[in-house]
Interface confidence: low
Amino acid sequence: EEELQVIQPDKSVLVAAGETATLRCTATSLIPVGPIQWFRGAGPGRELIYNQKEGHFPRVTTVSDLTKRNNMDFSIRIGNITPADAGTYYCVKFRKGSPDDVEFKSGAGTELSVRAKPSAPVVSGPAARATPQHTVSFTCESHGFSPRDITLKWFKNGNELSDFQTNVDPVGESVSYSIHSTAKVVLTREDVHSQVICEVAHVTLQGDPLRGTANLSETIRVPPTLEVTQQPVRAENQVNVTCQVRKFYPQRLQLTWLENGNVSRTETASTVTENKDGTYNWMSWLLVNVSAHRDDVKLTCQVEHDGQPAVSKSHDLKVSAHPKEQGSNTAAENTGSNERNIY
């Protein structure tokens, strides 16, 4: 008669973490009589997973009723699979012996691979803000996935980025893996509303990749442009000087007026207007009493934006000239300005 064979038909089984693995094993004969045991690994260090004859194995259930005399199906199910369960499982037939059962025949083994989902990607930007035209680095990390094959892509506003480096660790075999990627992004003045997205695709995600995002509003600093203009006022001895602070981000801004180098007034940007690109505009004005000055006045609008070194713009106010003439001259110099005059 034909000698018993232990058949493990599945060379490999792939199971998602938390799911149940089915390991199939059949025998071709009921003879010799004896129990079946399941082991993980081979050799003297192998780990007992299930013993038909005795023992308590709470995570393991049999597919068939092993108490039936004619049963030749020794398949098992292992519940609540974790990456630590990965390995090669052997179905081993023992024959009755005295005093101990003797190993008779082993199946070829079934490699259990555990599919674990990657964690949600976490995107981190630079610690300090940077200005347009500068290149900044973003990092993306995801952990705990298996198998090792994984795809990571970077996007900025839906456009795929190409300047990035990605590592999957560890390099060798492991129960689970981590991915780390660093992307370089060149900032533009329009990036206040921009987003950087790290997208991770893995077999466990069934075509629905995980995404991590970073808002460039947390990273970018758009320095303001300053324009100081002079308008006439009704009173013959007063001149209104405005400082237009345009296209800055973030909002944190402090403005100081200097008259001939002396601080006249300091204020903090509050009621700003927002541009479509997310940057802000603000205007400050200074009413100068010309009669209080014998000599020409140098007015300086000095702006400290987001803790950066101050930038300034000056305007020379000639006291000898008629204010209204000066105003008309200034207005002529700024033809096309759509800023509202404040009196």
Partner: antibody
Framework: VTLDESGGGLQTPGGALSLVCKAS????????MGWVRQAPGKGLEFVAG??????????TYGAAVNGRATISRDNGQSTVRLQLNNLRAEDTGIYFC??????????????????????WGHGTEVIVSS | AVTQPASVSANLGETVKITCSGD???YGWYQQKAPGSAPVTLI????KRPSNIPSRFSGSKSGSTATLTITGVQADDEAVYYC??????????FGAGTTLTVL
């Protein structure tokens, strides 16, 4: 899901044929694929199968073509190819490309074809005659 | 080997069962309305029904026998029904087919 077979036609005994199945509408590399044929007036016959699980690919062949057939897949192109050599008159029939329901889902990657086909191509006719 | 009856018949609206026996854990059921036409999958993995298949078709397995049940048979159900499974060597096997005649 669409499976389009090509490569059929009149073949010479002793010659070779190459059938290609172009798949679309699903994640090709996650599913087992196979070829099933039907000779004139006969039933369905398993020809070959190819499995994909955990990156490993394995093949299986029906007894009638064992040793003469080679099945392969190109996951990049989403195609499965059947090469059949030393053609015989009994190889005449309609050859269907089949997609199995088994694959890398939340379940095991079951290495099955004939018991779990969930999509079929329209078939390509092969006639082996001199 | 897979064994299924060569033919079965049923009156319109009746329930018909087609059996398939073999030594496998899983079975599929496939309908072919004309020789050479593409089969249609009714049931796979014993009892799973594709979304486009009416619930009139159901599959079950008990012991070594798989059963395809058609509830409320319609004239359009006239066809040849094949069961399929795989042997220990991963080789697919199809039954010879069962011809359903609707009376």
């Amino acid at each position: 899901v669409t499976l389009d077979e090509s490569g059929g036609g009149l073949q010479t005994p002793g010659g070779a044929l190459s059938l290609v199945c172009k798949a679309s509408g699903f994640t090709f590399n996650s599913y087992n694929m196979g070829w099933v044929r039907q000779a004139p007036g006969k039933g369905l016959e398993f020809v070959a199968g190819i499995y994909s699980a955990g990156g490993d690919t394995s093949t299986t062949y029906g007894a009638a073509v064992n040793g003469r057939a080679t099945i392969s897949r190109d996951n990049g192109q989403s195609t499965v190819r059947l090469q059949l050599n030393n053609l015989r008159a009994e190889d005449t029939g309609i050859y269907f490309c089949a997609k199995a329901a088994g694959g890398c889902t939340a379940h095991n990657c079951d290495a099955y074809i004939a018991d779990s086909i969930d999509a079929w191509g329209h078939g390509t006719e092969v006639i082996v005659s001199s | 080997a897979v064994t299924q009856p060569a033919s079965v018949s049923a009156n319109l609206g009746e329930t018909v069962k087609i059996t398939c026996s073999g030594d496998s854990s899983y079975y599929g059921w496939y309908q072919q309305k004309a020789p050479g036409s593409a089969p249609v999958t009714l049931i796979y993995d014993n009892d799973k029904r594709p979304s486009n298949i009416p619930s009139r078709f159901s599959g079950s397995k008990s012991g070594s026998t798989a059963t395809l049940t058609i509830t409320g048979v319609q004239a359009d159900d006239e066809a040849v029904y094949y069961c399929g499974n795989e042997d220990m060597n991963y080789v697919g096997i199809f039954g010879a087919g069962t011809t359903l005649t609707v009376l």
